[in-house]
Interface confidence: low
């Protein structure tokens, strides 16, 4: 972007202040929350979201667990410590000094503890479980267009390669998306499985984070795929740390 | 739904410069990349150079480096490609094409419909 | 530069025919290989991309397989359509670089 032009904003994320003031008055645009400069080619970190998204609501969820090591975020909405790369801290702390660890997605992956606790690397969430139901349709979706559709809304909304799309799983009205992405896996200038479901759960619950573009319009040959329940599991290349008292 | 319109045929002399534009549609123009590809009359495809249309950084195969300028104009979604001190090897039709950014994704899955651009004396 | 080298430079097959066209890079270029198809005045089509992924819209048979240094597409039961060039190209490092082509011909 030039200066003179006046389209300067963020395609990727609309929760960004932009202005051309980048080199060669090039568009350049920060998150809001944070001021840290988004690259606007490919989808925000959840974390800069995160922070950015501050002043939302906050939401709690369980259901029962589909492995005994996978995560659910209960605790909802918390302003994060992002760091340069826009990567969750290993450790997060509150403003009365309660800290815990987390994994790549931010998800809360210790007991809570104080300014002493340790959290020595930032575990990578390799495994994402994105559970929807869907609204009644007349009949069942044709599980091979539903998972090509599904597929196609990754790979093409979100830009995440369909090597890191493992499955798509059906049981009217139950569908499941499996993300699985090693760190081995992950080459530079690769969508991150956390970054893409958490747009994707975003655009869900019709709050989508892109920039001008319509909300998530999904249908399967015409026919809309209208979700009323959502739920996501994160699974860690670590197990998680809880004592046996939060597991019972 | 997603188009490259490129602009039309050029006649030009050895030694002189065209430009050939293509102009982008249905898609967010700086969420994907720009490549351009030629093709001579009977021969294979050849990749010129590409553009993160998002940073405005070009990168050019070093066949061109110093005869060929990539450049695009967010405002107008549009792609440029200049080639400069034209000969008759020059003759051949110029390919848009769209791409992502990371090397996991620098396939071309929309294209123009092609420019020729014929050098003769 | 990495040199993707096809083969056979021309194929002659029927409708109906399986039919299989080869590519080598001169080193490894892990699974990023994509491969286009193109008709006589017309510009290239994307089939498949990252070795084995078929593009949105293109007919399941055709398929891709390999890694490494050594890539197949395969065309399971030729369609009258399906007479064409056929390139492949590397999307692993820049320059990209392409096949010199296989020209599909009817027996």
């Known amino acids: 972007h030039t200066a003179a032009q006046d389209n300067c904003t963020c395609p990727t994320n609309k929760m960004t202040v932009c202005s051309p003031d980048g080199p060669g008055g090039r568009c350049q645009c920060r998150a809001l929350g944070s001021g840290m400069a988004v690259d606007c080619s490919t989808l925000t970190s959840k974390c800069l979201l995160l922070k950015a998204r501050m002043s939302a609501p906050k939401n709690a969820r369980t259901l029962v667990r589909p492995s005994e090591h996978a995560l659910v975020d209960n605790d909802g909405l918390y302003d994060p410590d992002c760091d340069p790369e826009g990567r969750f801290k290993a450790r997060q702390c509150n403003q009365t000094s309660v800290c815990w660890c987390v994994n790549s997605v931010g998800v809360r992956r210790t007991d809570k503890g104080d300014l002493s606790l340790r959290c020595d690397e930032l575990v990578r969430t390799h495994h994402i479980l994105i559970d929807l139901r869907h609204r009644p349709t007349a009949g069942a979706f044709n599980h091979s267009d539903l998972d090509a559709e599904l597929r196609r809304l990754f790979r093409e909304r979100y830009r995440l390669h369909p090597k890191f799309v493992a499955a798509v799983h059906y049981e009217q009205p139950t569908i499941q998306i499996e993300l699985r992405q090693n760190t081995s896996q992950k080459a530079a200038g690769d969508v991150d499985i956390g970054d893409a479901a958490y747009y994707f759960e975003r655009d869900i619950k019709g709050e989508s984070l892109f920039q001008g573009r319509g909300g998530l319009d999904l249908r399967v040959r015409g026919e809309p795929l209208q979700v009323e329940r959502t739920l996501i599991y994160y699974l860690d290349e670590i197990p998680p740390k809880f004592s046996m008292k939060r597991l019972t | 739904q997603v188009q490259l319109v490129q602009s039309g045929a050029e006649v030009k002399k050895p030694g002189a410069s065209v430009k050939v534009s293509c102009k982008a549609s249905g898609y967010t123009f700086t969420t994907a990349g720009m490549q351009w590809v030629r093709q001579a009359p009977g021969q294979g495809l050849e990749w010129m150079g590409w553009?993160?249309?998002?940073?405005?950084?070009?990168k050019y195969a070093e066949d061109f480096k110093g005869r060929v300028t990539i450049s695009a104009d967010t405002s107008t979604s549009t792609a440029y490609l200049q080639l400069s001190s034209l000969k008759s090897e020059d003759t051949a039709v110029y390919y848009c094409a769209r791409s992502g950014f990371g090397s996991s994704y620098w396939y071309f899955d929309v294209w123009g419909q092609g420019t020729l651009v014929t050098v003769s004396s | 530069d990495i040199q993707m080298t096809q083969s056979p430079s021309s194929l002659s097959a029927s409708v109906g025919d399986r039919v299989t066209i080869t590519c080598k890079a001169s080193?490894?270029?892990?699974?990023?290989v994509a491969w286009y198809q193109q008709k006589p005045g017309k510009a290239p089509k994307l089939l498949i991309y990252?070795?084995?992924y078929r593009y949105t819209g293109v007919p399941s048979r055709f398929s891709g397989s390999g890694s490494g240094t050594d890539f197949t597409l395969t065309i399971s039961s030729l369609q009258p359509e399906d007479f064409a060039v056929y390139y492949c190209q590397q999307h692993y490092i820049t320059p990209l670089t392409f096949g010199q082509g296989t020209k599909l011909e009817i027996k």
């Open positions: 080193q490894d270029v892990s699974t990023a």
């Open positions: 990252s070795a084995s």
């Open positions: 553009i993160n249309t998002h940073h405005g950084v070009p």
